[in-house]
Amino acid sequence: MSNVPHKSSLPEGIRPGTVLRIRGLVPPNASRFHVNLLCGEEQGSDAALHFNPRLDTSEVVFNSKEQGSWGREERGPGVPFQRGQPFEVLIIASDDGFKAVVGDAQYHHFRHRLPLARVRLVEVGGDVQLDSVRIF
């Protein structure tokens, strides 16, 4: 879509209690999109969180990437996204992990694999029409 990829720098990083709010629309022909919490602004930076709704395979994948290698994939229960429908995702940082809230309910808890303090960039991309990204 025209408004992605979206990148928001986090020069101060994030800490436990930080809430990231992503609002957007899943286009009617969407295949998949992603939200990455990256440890740097350069290409190939480590990813503390890779949140990847996949409409094409009906799954939502969570992962991390360190030194160019992806970790073990985790999957959330079901797919709380629909083509052609708006969505709101909250990613809540805590001491022990990232809590993803989609719509009305907690969706998945992804335990930290990389130090939270390393996160420096939020990136949203793929098949998504982005409305807003806010950090609280």
């Epitope: 809430v19 709010r21 609002r23 429908q85 708006p86 709101e88 909250l90 809540i92 809230v101 719509g103 009305d104 309910a105 907690q106 409305d131 807003s132 806010r134 609280f136």
Partner: nanobody
């Protein structure tokens, strides 16, 4: 600037009903969640109910009002309503509407929320 105009408060006997309204104007952005909070004399402001812009999302209710209060909204009028039935003395408070940046349930600890804008209050008094 966003303005939130609440109305509909008043005096009612226990068991009675009231309907509060809150109209948003100004630079409210598309898709905002709106909610109601209340503050009784000498107490902290507390969450009552909230509703998403999107009809696919379920409303949120505090346990103390569940089954008695119903929140609804008219997006074409940028207005949110709170229908309050079976009112009790403990519902007496000043009721505030708000634009809610985010809200989520956190198990036994209830709801966490962040408020973008507060409206001014409307007084509800339940007494015989």
């Amino acid at each position: 600037e966003v303005q939130l105009q609440a109305s509909g408060g008043g005096f009612v006997q226990p068991g009675g009903s009231l309907r509060l309204s809150c109209a948003a104007s100004g630079s409210t952005s598309y898709g905002e969640t709106m909610g109601w909070f209340r503050q009784a004399p000498g107490k902290e402001r507390e969450f009552v109910s909230a509703i998403s812009y999107y009809s696919t999302r379920k409303p949120y209710y505090a346990d103390s009002v569940k089954g008695r209060f119903t929140i609804s909204r008219d997006n074409s009028k940028n207005t949110v309503y709170l229908q309050m039935n079976s009112l009790r003395a403990e519902d007496t408070a000043t009721y505030y509407c708000a634009i809610v940046a985010y809200i989520y349930a956190d198990g036994v600890r209830g709801y966490h929320q962040k408020i973008d804008y507060w409206g001014q209050g409307t007084q509800v008094t339940v007494s015989s």
